[in-house]
């Protein structure tokens, strides 16, 4: 996902709706004007705001990277939702890119969880049932399995 940036608003175009701030704040989908007296709507598909705010600009919409699919578009009140393509996942500790899921588990381990857009396949030791974490094993150590078939 392209890092969310903040878009300075240009002078409000005629089509941008204006209303007055309430308790000094503007509603989701708006930002406050430079004199603090008006609320100016965000531009659909370009920027957004999710909460009541007194920001002088709306947040710039995220653009999904190649390798991602757009689950829902950016609206004036919600950012774009992007998801990794099938066969890839995004880890919490490295959210900037989608990584390829492993094709199978190391020898002596069995797959208990499938590849999802937010997690790699999950492997556990056959005997102890403890999870395996770490890098994908070397190819010769890998036992591949087709979906739904336990690795032997």
């Amino acid at each position: 996902i392209t890092q969310q940036d903040l878009a300075p608003q240009q002078r409000a175009a005629p089509q941008q709706k204006r209303s007055s701030p309430s308790e000094g704040l503007c509603p989701p989908g708006h930002h406050i004007s430079e004199d603090g007296r008006d609320c100016i709507s965000c531009k659909y598909g370009q920027d957004y705001s999710t909460h009541w705010n007194d920001l002088l600009f709306c947040l710039r919409c995220t653009r999904c990277d190649s390798g991602e699919v757009e689950l829902s578009p950016c609206t004036t009140t919600r950012n774009t939702v992007c998801q990794c393509e099938e066969g890839t996942f995004r880890e919490e500790d490295s959210p900037e890119m989608c990584r390829k899921c492993r094709t199978g588990c190391p020898r002596g381990m069995v797959k208990v969880g499938d590849c999802t857009p937010w997690s790699d396949i999950e492997c556990v030791h056959k005997e102890s049932g403890t999870k395996h974490s770490g890098e994908a094993p070397a190819v010769e150590e890998t036992v591949t399995s087709s979906p739904g078939t336990p690795a032997s």
Partner: antibody
Framework: EVQLVETGGGLIQPGGSLRLSCAAS????????MIWVRQAPGKGLEYIGF???????YYADSAKGRFTISRDNSKNTLYLQMNSLRAEDTAVYYC???????????WGRGTLVTVSS | DIQMTQSPSSLSASVGDRVTITCRAS??????LSWYQQKPGQPPKRLIY???TLASGVPSRFSGSGSGTDFTLTISSLQPEDFATYYC????????????FGGGTKVEIK
Amino acid sequence: EVQLVETGGGLIQPGGSLRLSCAASGFTVSRYAMIWVRQAPGKGLEYIGFITSDGSTYYADSAKGRFTISRDNSKNTLYLQMNSLRAEDTAVYYCARYTYSDGTDLWGRGTLVTVSS
Amino acid sequence: DIQMTQSPSSLSASVGDRVTITCRASQSISTYLSWYQQKPGQPPKRLIYKASTLASGVPSRFSGSGSGTDFTLTISSLQPEDFATYYCQPNSGIATYGAAFGGGTKVEIK
């Protein structure tokens, strides 16, 4: 002349209360957002809170619960009510005019508050 | 809340030197940043707003630049009256995020 003048500072015992005033001249306080900022001796500027033109108030976390900002439009004056004062509240207190995009464009000269027994 | 990190916290320079002070915001604030100068016993004075717009009456040797999270105040040729402490402050979302000042940069005579 456009100016802000703070009054009400002085020596106060820990646990006491104090109300600072900020009298504006040359402009109407109710047409602007106004902020309070303080500066402990030898330290940097610390934002306390602000009041919007429609009278809504917002505070820094350090000021929530003990400090209250208000305004009297008929007197063109801003106030800072400070309760349960502590030694670490000793500072020069400034009121200032805040213009959203243009920052804090007009400052008072400040009033010194000393909290000590 | 937005945190503002200023560097350096102090510097020594001579008259005529070019001085650069930086301010980093913990999140993007577009170009909505102001710089202030404060001399001992005086209130702060606004120098620059909207990152690069010079306030009325401020000498042209002062300039500001930057957008997003990284900002710079430059004094092109330091004058005796410029020895002071300088602060940055974000100007967007004061109710949403607060308006914490940077920690300050004290410019001293070398």
